[in-house]
């Protein structure tokens, strides 16, 4: 019988980069088997992370996998940091590795970024 | 229960290329990411490189132009190549689960001896 | 590449000891450090993960503190089973490895 835990599918070291003022979508890929776990996001703030329990947050269902959602509408300077997404299955509680925003401020941007970098995905898409 | 099992040629001689095999049980490599990891006699532990679960891979910076890891989803099997073997990639090679976070290692294989000397 | 710095290299102790092992990461690495034992003959074991965590059925005498760069693994009451070497790993980035403490019991 194969193992079935509750998987985060996020890289090491993964990071965005994004401008202040656009709408971003923060995914946390999960892989469950039966029920959905529940997931939070949290920002890290020196040693400890915060959880972000008054943001707007959703889940998109895929195939074979499922992504919970850090919507930022739209994203604010003080938005750039690293941030966690954590799942609580049978309790135990898993953490995924970190995910970094570098939120860049209109104001002070010279050019914006590309297309790809904009659309860059660091995290592990499953196929 | 989660197994590991590694097989490898045990001996190989010096400028020659190792190959060696990774077959897991009771979970899916679709589903898990693997390292591979080795340990030269008494000393310790140095991280290869891994394969994710899409097939994409991570190496060690300082070895990266001599692996190459690759899988075999349906078989079940990881495999690690190295090239160009020197005496002191004589070692134990290991290869190890990933947590479900992928931020330990929670399996580990026995690991298969390599020596390299002709 | 994060160097993680390890000491002491061996420790000689008696069962009932308190032993504090320690690891130093050349730069900060949150909480993404990993704590292994192997005993002689045998492929490593997890026992602490997020620096903190006991891993499912490891004893509690097992713990393990530390955030960025500085952590610490603790037996609270050395066992003579816990005769092993213990390495801290890092997995902030591309993962690597403490030079280990050989825990020899007196």
């Known amino acids: 019988k194969e193992s079935c835990d509750v998987q985060l599918y996020i890289k090491r070291q993964s990071e965005h980069s994004i401008l202040a003022g656009d709408p971003f979508e923060l995914e946390c890929p999960v892989k469950y088997c039966a029920n959905r776990p529940h997931v939070t996001w949290c920002k890290l703030n020196g040693t400890t992370c915060v959880k972000l329990e008054d943001r707007q947050t959703s889940w998109k269902e895929e195939k074979n996998i499922s992504f919970f959602i850090l919507h930022f509408e739209p994203v604010l300077p003080n938005d750039n940091g690293s941030y966690r997404c954590s799942a609580n299955f049978q309790s135990n509680l898993i953490e995924s590795h970190s995910t970094t925003l570098y939120v860049t401020d209109v104001k002070s941007a010279s050019e914006r970024p590309s297309k790809d970098e904009m659309a860059s995905r660091p995290w592990l898409l499953y196929r | 229960q989660v197994q590991l099992k590694e097989s490898g040629p045990g001996l190989v001689a010096p400028s020659q290329s190792l190959s060696i095999t990774c077959t897991v049980s009771?979970?899916?490599?679709?589903?898990?990411?693997v390292n591979w990891v080795r340990q030269p006699p008494g000393k310790g532990l140095e991280w290869l490189g891994m394969?994710?679960?899409?097939?994409?891979?991570d190496y060690n910076s300082a070895l990266k132009s001599r692996l190459s890891i690759n899988k075999d989803n349906s078989k079940s099997q990881v495999f690690l190549k190295m090239n160009s073997l020197q005496t002191d990639d004589t070692a134990r090679y290991y290869c190890?689960?990933?947590?479900?976070?992928?931020?330990?290692?929670?399996?580990w294989g026995q690991g298969t001896s390599v020596t390299v000397s002709s | 590449s994060i160097v993680m710095t390890q000491t002491p290299k061996f420790l000689l102790v008696s069962a009932g000891d308190r032993v504090t092992i320690t690891c130093k990461a050349s730069?900060?690495?949150?909480?993404?450090v990993a704590w292994y034992q192997q005993k002689p003959g045998q492929s490593p074991k997890l026992l602490i993960y997020?620096?903190?965590n006991r891993y499912t059925g490891v004893p509690d005498r097992f713990t393990g503190s530390g955030y960025g760069t500085d952590f610490t693994f603790t037996i609270s009451t050395v066992q003579a089973e816990d005769l092993a070497v213990y390495f801290c790993?890092?997995?902030?980035?591309?993962?690597?490895f403490g030079g280990g403490t050989k825990l020899e019991i007196k």
């Open positions: 790993q890092q997995d902030y980035n591309s993962p690597t």
């Open positions: 009771g979970f899916s490599l679709t589903g898990y990411g």
């Open positions: 730069q900060s690495v949150s909480n993404d």
């Open positions: 190890a689960r990933d947590r479900p976070d992928g931020r330990a290692m929670d399996y």
């Open positions: 394969i994710w679960i899409d097939g994409s891979t």
């Open positions: 997020y620096a903190s």
